[in-house]
Amino acid sequence: SEVEYRAEVGQNAYLPCFYTPAAPGNLVPVCWGKGACPVFECGNVVLRTDERDVNYWTSRYWLNGDFRKGDVSLTIENVTLADSGIYCCRIQIPGIMNDEKFNLKLVIKPAKVTPAPTLQRDFTAAFPRMLTTRGHGPAETQTLGSLPDINLTQISTLANELRDSRLANDLRDSGATIRIG
């Protein structure tokens, strides 16, 4: 089953997706779609990048990270209950059947009555505790694992943002894998 991410109505939702560019600026086309990843494409596309830039996006969907370094995590602004569902992140690596496909489940909860402290960035769930198993057909698509291809600088940034938050323990306990390439 896919990894689940949560956000409250009115918040921004964050769906992580990363890859490691072969060289700085040597980007790979990426698409985000609403719905599970089909066999070749991305479902109902909400955002797309090419080898140079973001070339298609719809309102409320944007990339908050540095996509030129492979951080293609999706931010959905001001979510509503209708934003719940499966999202597809597809990294369209050139070559024969090289695509990386990740299905992520977004669960939107009604807003809490009592205000809660917010982070600099809206992290919508504890980091997942499972690793990626990569496949090619939809039937073989597994789950997005614990922040693949993240580097130490990103971890440091995340830790700073999470300090003094209830998510700090989740980060510590998540078993997040760090790969430096």
Partner: antibody, heavy 119, light 111 residues
Framework: EVQLVESGGGLVQPGGSLRLSCAAS????????MSWVRQAPGKGLEWVAA???????YFPDSVKGRFTISRDNAKNSCYLQMNSLRAEDTAVYYC?????????????WGQGTLVTVSS | EIVLTQSPATLSVSPGERATLSCRAS??????????MQWYQQKPGQAPRLLIY???NVESGVPARFSGSGSGTDFTLTISSLQSEDFAVYYC?????????FGGGTKVEIK
């Protein structure tokens, strides 16, 4: 109106090569996965290659290593390069547009081009 | 690969009658609640034409007498009242995984 027009078919000897072209019009070509599907005389349909909108390539084992697919979005064209051809590759080759947002099934087809592999 | 078996190979039907075509997959083609099965019609000398996608969705421009049903591994194409232009070969196709595969076809002929 969506149109797909194949060309490049013909007679080729076993072991030879052929390059098929598919000229597309009437839609935003770069947004769609494209496939080639073939049909041997009197037989059923067989999918032989696909290229996604992002340029990823897909083949069945029967042609992997012998066929390659490419696209030129500037020319609204898709190509099938066939090498090391065998008698069993004889077929009508159709260019087909994958359904937008999916790509795994085909909502528009060309009329096909016949490839005959024979000595 | 997913093998699709169509039956019968040939179906003899009179105009106005109902035709029921079957397609069985060697494994499930269910994916997140959707059945990734399609049906095509092909007439002699012509390219195939998409009739049904995702098991039961009728493609735009296809007459309402065509319908699809099924889930998992068993799928059916029904033509409620055969017209003269419906006599053709019908293929099922799965888009669950690579390689994409087609069934062997069912020929619907005039009885």
């Amino acid at each position: 109106e969506v149109q797909l027009v194949e060309s490049g078919g013909g007679l080729v000897q076993p072991g030879g090569s052929l390059r098929l072209s598919c000229a597309a019009s009437g839609f935003t070509f770069s947004r769609y996965a494209m496939s080639w599907v073939r049909q041997a005389p009197g037989k059923g349909l067989e999918w032989v290659a696909a290229i996604s909108s992002g340029g990823s390539l897909y083949f069945p084992d029967s042609v992997k290593g012998r066929f390659t697919i490419s696209r030129d979005n500037a020319k609204n064209s898709c190509y099938l390069q066939m090498n090391s051809l065998r008698a069993e590759d004889t077929a009508v080759y159709y260019c087909a547009r994958g359904r937008e947002a999916d790509g795994g099934y085909f909502d528009y087809w060309g009329q096909g081009t016949l490839v005959t592999v024979s000595s | 690969e997913i093998v699709l078996t169509q039956s019968p190979a040939t179906l003899s039907v009179s105009p106005g009658e109902r035709a029921t075509l079957s397609c069985r997959a060697s494994e499930s083609v269910e994916y997140y609640g959707t059945s990734l099965m399609q049906w095509y019609q092909q007439k002699p000398g012509q390219a195939p034409r998409l009739l049904i996608y995702a098991a039961s969705n009728v493609e735009s421009g296809v007459p309402a007498r065509f319908s699809g049903s099924g889930s998992g591994t068993d799928f059916t194409l029904t033509i409620s009242s055969l017209q003269s232009e419906d006599f053709a070969v019908y293929y099922c196709q799965q888009s669950m995984k690579v390689p994409l595969t087609f069934g062997g076809g069912t020929k619907v002929e005039i009885k």
